[in-house]
């Protein structure tokens, strides 16, 4: 029983349980394909426990392997709409530091209006994740349609 | 080595490893959009460790942040079928207690026959999750095509 | 503080944190629908911590419940291409030992060019997972478009 007590007394941070789930705040200005995220209990069911937001982008605070997941739904979209607009693509990647810049996850919408995926990837303290949406259809801001999150899995 | 032994002796429940993976049992009656789930080793590869089923809906037994995931495939479906029966939408939400009712995850099929997604969300003991399928196409009951699960991630 | 120290000193393997993320190496010969995977830091961001590769297929080393996830993108694909080459299907299953052979996860591309999904499933030491792609379109080998992974979740 001593172990269970010790576990409860330890701060969760020491167990490396960093986790975040974000909702869409807004899209970027004209030449900026990035999505800008927000999180926190005042906003609904989004949260940040460990990672932080830096100008709407997610910054990692603990080295480790993470499960990264995302869903983006295009607003006012049908398969017809999607086919009549420039191909829409979503890419999640490390955008800073520049030396570690890489695309982690990429999906095209084709004739669909939602993409959803997830992957395991090593991330390091200070890595900032960016989600780039290219295309001419606006992403939905509904919190059950568009969200982005990470979960620390192991060192 | 004492720690490893202690860990093995502790019931998993004390580590908060609640997890469930369910397979489709049946759809609801005429005016009920809910999918009804079932789980247990006798049924194949579905299981419940912590959460419980309440009349085919998943009830949470431990507070925490959970990864919720789902895949639903429409039966006897092609992109032509899907577009002719549009819109078919799947929503996962907390349906009880009523005071906590909220949609957590929503996807439309558009011209596709399968949706799959996942998200992190806080859930509380007693929350019941419902999966509502609106549309006129039946979901497949194949266990590798339609499934629904949750995994406790952290307090 | 003793617990935290002990936790750090214990090999991660004793915590059961088996995890792997693989990238596509190549497709199989004519009559072999399997995808052949590769992983390791020399290849980029793929890795194996616990599970092993056996002739390009993933072999499990620890009993438990795993989160299995996959994304496969078809190369040189548009919704028109996809619909003209229908049906392309991806199935993830246990392919050996033969006594445990079963399909765990199945998706069709229909008019899309990417499938992505995930599920929880019990796996046993020695289980080998195969990913079968049927159809006439080649999968992309881009590491941000096609990947396959598992994460040990609990015993």
């Amino acid at each position: 029983q001593r172990f269970a007590q010790a576990q409860q007394q330890l701060p969760l941070e020491s167990l490396g349980w960093d986790v975040a789930e974000l909702q869409l705040n807004h899209t970027g200005p004209q030449q900026d394909p990035r999505l800008y995220w927000q999180g926190g209990p005042a906003l609904g069911r989004s949260f940040l426990h460990g990672p932080e937001l830096d100008k709407g982008q997610l910054r990692i605070h603990r080295d480790g392997i993470y499960m990264v997941h995302i869903q983006v739904t295009l607003a006012i979209c049908s398969s017809t709409t999607a086919s009549r607009h420039h191909p829409t693509t979503l890419a999640v990647g490390i955008c800073s530091p520049a030396s570690r810049s890489i695309s982690l996850l990429r999906l095209s919408f084709h004739q669909g209006c939602t993409i959803a995926s997830q992957r395991l990837t090593p991330l390091a303290r200070g890595d900032t994740l960016c989600t780039n949406l290219t295309g001419t259809l606006l992403p939905s801001r509904n919190t059950d349609e568009t969200f982005f999150g990470v979960q620390w899995v192991r060192p | 080595q004492r720690f490893a032994q202690a860990q093995q002796q502790l019931p998993l429940e004390s580590l908060g490893w609640d997890v469930a993976e369910l397979q489709l049992n049946h759809t609801g009656p005429q005016q009920d959009p809910r999918l009804y789930w079932q789980g247990g080793p006798a049924l194949g590869r579905s299981f419940l460790h912590g959460p419980e089923l309440d009349k085919g809906q998943l009830r949470i037994h431990r507070d925490g942040i959970y990864m919720v995931h789902i895949q639903v495939t429409l039966a006897i479906c092609s992109s032509t079928t899907a577009s002719r029966h549009h819109p078919t939408t799947l929503a996962v939400g907390i349906c009880s207690p009523a005071s906590r009712s909220i949609s957590l995850l929503r996807l439309s099929f558009h011209q596709g026959c399968t949706i799959a997604s996942q998200r992190l969300t806080p859930l509380a003991r007693g929350d019941t999750l419902c999966t509502n399928l609106t549309g006129t196409l039946l979901p497949s009951r194949n266990t590798d095509e339609t499934f629904f699960g949750v995994q406790w991630v952290r307090p | 503080q003793r617990f935290a120290q002990a936790q750090q000193q214990l090999p991660l393997e004793s915590l059961g944190w088996d995890v792997a993320e693989l990238q596509l190496n190549h497709t199989g010969p004519q009559q072999d629908p399997r995808l052949y995977w590769q992983g390791g830091p020399a290849l980029g961001r793929s890795f194996l911590h616990g599970p092993e590769l056996d002739k390009g297929q993933l072999r499990i080393h620890r009993d438990g419940i795993y989160m299995v996830h996959i994304q496969v993108t078809l190369a040189i694909c548009s919704s028109t291409t996809a619909s003209r080459h229908h049906p392309t299907t991806l199935a993830v299953g246990i392919c050996s030992p033969a006594s445990r052979s079963i399909s765990l996860l199945r998706l069709s591309f229909h008019q899309g060019c990417t499938i992505a999904s995930q599920r929880l499933t019990p796996l046993a030491r020695g289980d080998t997972l195969c990913t079968n792609l049927t159809g006439t379109l080649l999968p992309s080998r881009n590491t941000d478009e096609t990947f396959f992974g598992v994460q040990w979740v609990r015993p």
């Epitope: 004209q30 086919s83 009549r84 259809l137 509904n142 | - | -």
Partner: antibody, heavy 119, light 111 residues
Framework: EVQLVQSGAEVKKPGASVKVSCKAS????????IHWVRQAPGQGLEWMGD????????SYNQKFRDRVTMTRDTSTSTVYMELSSLRSEDTAVYYC????????????WGQGTLVTVSS | DIVMSQSPDSLAVSLGERATINCRAS??????????MHWYQQKPGQPPKLLIY???NLESGVPDRFSGSGSGTNFTLTISSLQAEDVAVYYC?????????FGGGTKVEIK
């Protein structure tokens, strides 16, 4: 700099057809839908439809569906709007317009083409 | 089709005073976390100029005396301090669904 340059004014007889062009420059032509909006003298604005230059797919306002055709020529980065069976009430300034990043609102406009329908 | 009703038809305001234009949609133009309402200014012999998009976002280069508000069916364009160069006709437009439709316009003049 994004520019939309339209063809010159036209005078047409009732029952005839008119084809107005809109030449785009300063951006990747196939990326952005081009919309057409008309304005009768002293009246408000009326959306006619749009075309996606990437594949030529067009969507029309039901009001004009039987009479309007939108096409594009990717080699010259030009979009065309043809209106047939002209009547006097089609007398208007016809504008092509483009959105900035996301579709739905128009940040860039052509200078307008006056089409006069008169017997 | 969604019908857009603008009021008033015309408005005379003193220089430096506030001008308020209203636009009502026949049904809600808000969905997916946005209000699909946009405002334009048009001067004689010129094409319309985008002022406000998605109900409240100021288009680049537009003076900040222009602002937009509202959601659902009721929207407002406000000019906080009218300048001589603001004399024009102002139109609202929705993009909630096809066909897009415009309001009938409001003519703003100096009193």
């Amino acid at each position: 700099e994004v520019q939309l340059v339209q063809s010159g004014a036209e005078v047409k007889k009732p029952g005839a057809s008119v084809k107005v062009s809109c030449k785009a420059s300063g951006y990747t032509f196939t990326t952005y839908n081009i919309h057409w909006v008309r304005q009768a003298p002293g009246q408000g604005l009326e959306w006619m439809g749009d075309i996606y230059p990437g594949n030529g797919d067009a969507s029309y306002n039901q009001k004009f569906r039987d009479r309007v055709t939108m096409t594009r020529d990717t080699s010259t980065s030009t979009v065309y709007m043809e209106l047939s069976s002209l009547r006097s009430e089609d007398t208007a300034v016809y504008y092509c317009a483009r959105f900035s990043r996301f579709d739905g609102w128009f940040a860039y406009w052509g200078q307008g083409t006056l089409v006069t329908v008169s017997s | 089709d969604i019908v857009m009703s603008q009021s008033p038809d015309s408005l005379a305001v003193s220089l430096g005073e506030r001008a308020t234009i209203n636009c009502r949609a026949s049904r809600s133009v808000s969905t997916s976390g946005y209000s699909y309402m946009h405002w334009y200014q048009q001067k004689p012999g010129q094409p319309p100029k985008l002022l406000i998009y998605l109900a409240s976002n100021l288009e680049s280069g537009v003076p900040d005396r222009f602002s937009g508000s509202g959601s659902g069916t009721n929207f407002t364009l406000t000019i906080s301090s009218l300048q001589a160069e603001d004399v024009a006709v102002y139109y609202c437009q929705h993009s909630r669904e096809l066909p897009y439709t415009f309001g009938g316009g409001t003519k703003v003049e100096i009193k």
